[in-house]
């Protein structure tokens, strides 16, 4: 009796179970009652990453330098090319089809997490006792200067954007 279902890595055609083509190969011809499935390797710049019965291999992704992309990992017959972004840029999506410039953290905000090729800068507001007076993709919030440790007193209070201003203590006459 002809099968109605096949084992893993097989497919049903013409009432028989045929082996799927291995990753890196495409289907040329179904198996016959005499012979196994006929498969051929994917060409240069093509891939198939699963056991399959595909009649065409997929094209490797192109990392377009005009979009700020570069090759992170070259594709093989079994894997796609992995793109990443040039220094100072990050991917706009998980698929990394284009890049945007890393965001800078404005004064009053510091860098919580430095950007990578796939994630943007994460900024955080400087809490009390910390400040940032620059727009930067790298600078964290800096702690206010401790006037006391310098034997000075606070002459001007700090904000999230400015450091405290220290001055000499008033001498008792």
């Amino acid at each position: 009796e002809p099968p109605t279902a096949c084992r893993e890595k097989q497919y049903l055609i013409n009432s028989q179970c045929c082996s799927l083509c291995q990753p890196g190969q495409k289907l040329v011809s179904d198996c016959t009652e005499f012979t196994e499935t006929e498969c051929l390797p994917c060409g240069e710049s093509e891939f198939l990453d699963t056991w399959n019965r595909e009649t065409h291999c997929h094209q490797h992704k192109y990392c377009d330098p005009n979009l700020g992309l570069r090759v992170q990992q070259k594709g093989t017959s079994e894997t796609d090319t992995i793109c990443t972004c040039e220094e100072g840029w990050h991917c706009t999506s998980e698929a990394c089809e284009s890049c945007v410039l890393h965001r800078s953290c404005s004064p009053g905000f510091g860098v919580k997490q430095i950007a990578t090729g796939v994630s943007d800068t994460i900024c955080e507001p400087c809490p009390v006792g910390f400040f940032s007076n620059v727009s930067s993709a790298f600078e964290k919030c800096h702690p206010w200067t401790s006037c006391e440790t310098k034997d000075l007193v606070v002459q001007q209070a700090g904000t999230n954007k400015t450091d405290v201003v220290c001055g000499p203590q008033d001498r008792l006459r």
């Epitope: 040329v28 006929e38 051929l40």
Partner: antibody
Framework: QVQLVQSGGGLVQPGGSLRLSCAAS????????MSWVRQAPGKGLEWVAN????????YYVDSVKGRFTISRDNAKNSLYLQLNSLRAEDTAEYYC?????????WGQGTLVTVSS | QSALTQPASVSGSPGQSITVSCTGT?????????VSWYQQHPGKAPKLIIY???SRPSGVSNRYSGSKSGNTASLTISGLQAEDEADYYC??????????FGGGTKVTVLG
């Protein structure tokens, strides 16, 4: 059961044209590459051409490039070979075969004779 | 697209083993394990007897075996029988996505 039934052979003058057909049955024609192989009288086998499942890839032996065209009609389960600018050296038995590079099934063959 | 090289003829006595060689290049036999062997009796279509270098189609006698070393493939027929008398052709897929056949070998069973 798998069957490949050929037609279209015959006598043709040098420079003439002919179209060979191969009607397939007993298998899923549209998921298989198909090929043509020829054999001159008293000579060996010579691979001529093959075509992928949807006709987007076609390959030919150098000696027939630009003169012969392989094609298929998946709706009709048929394979074709258009032979143009025929030469005496194209005289041969022409076989259609199922597959891209190995052939478990062959047509019965059709004789093409190029002679004036 | 040069034909693969086979000896024109090979002969042996019944019960003997014979080997038919098939020599190609790096860009066909050397680079691919897509070598097939066909048997052809006079007036008949070829019959596939070995594929993918050493696989035997079901129903083909296990007296036929195939192998490959470098750019040369071989077909061995053991326990030679009268019905083995035929022409034998090797073929290989090539780097230019084409197929090439050998010139053919006439196997004669003596006696």
């Amino acid at each position: 059961q798998v069957q490949l039934v050929q037609s279209g052979g015959g006598l043709v003058q040098p420079g003439g044209s002919l179209r060979l057909s191969c009607a397939a049955s007993g298998f899923t024609f549209s998921s298989n590459w198909m090929s043509w192989v020829r054999q001159a009288p008293g000579k060996g086998l010579e691979w001529v051409a093959n075509i992928n499942q949807d006709g987007s890839e076609k390959y030919y032996v150098d000696s027939v490039k630009g003169r012969f065209t392989i094609s298929r009609d998946n709706a009709k389960n048929s394979l074709y070979l258009q032979l143009n600018s025929l030469r005496a050296e194209d005289t041969a038995e022409y076989y259609c075969a199922r597959g891209g590079y190995r052939y478990a099934y062959w047509g019965q063959g059709t004789l093409v004779t190029v002679s004036s | 697209q040069s034909a693969l090289t086979q000896p024109a003829s090979v002969s042996g006595s019944p019960g003997q083993s014979i080997t038919v060689s098939c020599t190609g290049t790096r860009s066909d036999i050397g680079d691919y394990n897509y070598v097939s062997w066909y048997q052809q009796h006079p007036g008949k279509a070829p019959k596939l007897i070995i594929y993918d270098v050493s696989s035997r189609p079901s129903g083909v006698s296990n007296r036929y075996s195939g192998s490959k070393s470098g750019n040369t493939a071989s077909l061995t027929i053991s326990g030679l029988q009268a019905e083995d008398e035929a022409d034998y052709y090797c073929s290989s897929y090539t780097s230019s996505s084409t197929l090439v056949f050998g010139g053919g070998t006439k196997v004669t069973v003596l006696g």
